[in-house]
Amino acid sequence: SSPCPQAWGPPGVQYGQPGRSVKLCCPGVTAGDPVSWFRDGEPKLLQGPDSGLGHELVLAQADSTDEGTYICQTLDGALGGTVTLQLGYPPARPVVSCQAADYENFSCTWSPSQISGLPTRYLTSYRKKTVLGADSQRRSPSTGPWPCPQDPLGAARCVVHGAEFWSQYRINVTEVNPLGASTRLLDVSLQSILRPDPPQGLRVESVPGYPRRLRASWTYPASWPCQPHFLLKFRLQYRPAQHPAWSTVEPAGLEEVITDAVAGLPHAVRVSARDFLDAGTWSTWSPEAWGTPSTGTIPKEIPAWGQLHTQPEVEPQVDSPAPPRPSLQPHPRLLDHRDSVEQVAVLA
């Protein structure tokens, strides 16, 4: 058997660190057997059999010029083996972050904090942590660790499925290379890393006869569980074209009627979602959807819900524009006749 322990990595390759002393081991001899060492393709003897170092070659303060292939020969000139030296660094602790788009699963991604220059792999695992005693601040690892399954395509990501929303988890990502291993531990609470995906299917429609109204509707993100135990709340922003500032409202449901749109101008609308009890953070904004309030007046036939106000909305008053104001309905309805006359504003 070879006197050389096989480091993790390709066969026949041995590893060292720049600036450090490096020992190369002749693989095809018995431990302690004296050998001669040569660089591949070079006749010059690097170290003779009388060095007293047996089957090892010592390179003091290795640098990049020492990288390459070495040949060792026994006393009778037989080939003891070839060794390739590759220099690099031990692993540094990777940088790890975790995120959750729903309350049942979370994923963790990592990046090396320093490139080692050597073959590298990552070991990923997690354990659930439990609180000891009602008043105790101490936490102790419970069962586990379990593997955190990595994405098959080599992306630096692993996913924990079936996580418990109220539990805390300790994630372990260990960077391993032939010179060692280094571990980053990250304590993760699903509540704090929850960030839903943005709402989907955002539509913006005019409301016939109401030149200052727009109706926006959307759906839950597809990644949110179909039968949610936890609901989402929403934040909606809108602004007229060419207007820099967004107006913001928090709708009560999956739609909102904007009552202070600027007549005749297209409006951008976007929505964001968050756990309804404020766990985690707001999602990114959805892609913007655009809509323009209708022109003209209320239809002659009064809709079933229309009771009192059937007169047309007043014409734009260019000389005294009203500033946009937020829409304040607590629960959106398609039409809300609380305003007897909606003033129409245009931007100066």
């Epitope: 940088v95 990046s111 090396p112 904090s113 320093q114 490139i115």
Partner: antibody, heavy 118, light 107 residues
Framework: EVQLLESGGGLVQPGGSLRLSCAAS????????MTWVRQAPGKGLEWVSS????????QYADSVKGRFTISRDNSKNTLYLQMNSLRAEDTAVYYC???????????WGRGTLVTVSS | DIQMTQSPSSLSASVGDRVTITCQAS??????LNWYQQKPGKAPKLLIY???NLQTGVPSRFSGSGSGTDFTFTISSLQPEDIATYYC?????????FGPGTKVDIK
């Protein structure tokens, strides 16, 4: 020899923007995490932001989150700090620093002074 | 964030004296602690990493010890060129934090 040279500092009004650069040489820039650390006049050191070699992970101090953006261009061996919505309390000497790893600063530049004042 | 405290905030000692600075973390940081020296008008310099390892080229009169939450930095024999402010810094988590510093001068 490792060298880090910051530039881009200067006087800016509150609410203004500034972009700092750090030109690196003497090492394989794309192998190392890089960091910005600042020091207000007469005060201690404050970590600002760090970025991994690939640029894929960044981290910010709470005091600058949402206003500052760290980035890097490995082809130019340069680290950047885009500073927006500057405040008087951002006045400091800004140092660029290099690993090893994340959080150990073995090499530092000389710093560039940012003054936020009206 | 992990808070770091240092004591004393300043000290005066004679050349040749043994000087000790302590640093305390608000939670366990293992041995993920560094010590830096900063001279007036200069950038900081790494002296000790991983609580007790001497950075290459740093004189052996500087040393560090400790783990968990309590750490010590020692200058075994103070020299005139050691006049500086010394900072501890944790990097247990992804948001490193510095101690407030200890200013050392000569009596």
């Amino acid at each position: 020899e490792v060298q880090l040279l910051e530039s881009g500092g200067g006087l800016v009004q509150p609410g203004g923007s500034l972009r700092l650069s750090c030109a690196a040489s003497g090492f394989t820039f794309s192998w190392y995490s890089m960091t910005w650390v600042r020091q207000a006049p007469g005060k201690g050191l404050e970590w600002v932001s760090s970025i991994v070699p690939s640029g894929g992970h960044t981290q910010y101090a709470d005091s600058v989150k949402g206003r500052f953006t760290i980035s890097r261009d490995n082809s130019k061996n340069t680290l950047y700090l885009q500073m927006n919505s500057l405040r008087a309390e951002d006045t400091a000497v800004y140092y660029c620093a290099k690993g090893p790893g994340w959080g150990t600063f073995a090499y530092w530049g000389r710093g560039t002074l940012v003054t936020v004042s009206s | 964030d992990i808070q770091m405290t240092q004591s004393p905030s300043s000290l005066s000692a004679s050349v040749g004296d043994r000087v000790t600075i302590t640093c305390q973390a608000s939670q366990d940081i293992n041995n993920y602690l560094n010590w830096y020296q900063q001279k007036p008008g200069k950038a900081p310099k790494l002296l000790i990493y991983d609580a007790s390892n001497l950075q290459t080229g740093v004189p052996s009169r500087f040393s560090g010890s400790g783990s968990g939450t309590d750490f010590t930095f020692t200058i075994s024999s103070l020299q005139p060129e050691d006049i500086a402010t010394y900072y501890c810094q944790q990097y247990d988590n992804l948001s490193p934090t510095f101690g407030p510093g200890t200013k050392v001068d000569i009596k």
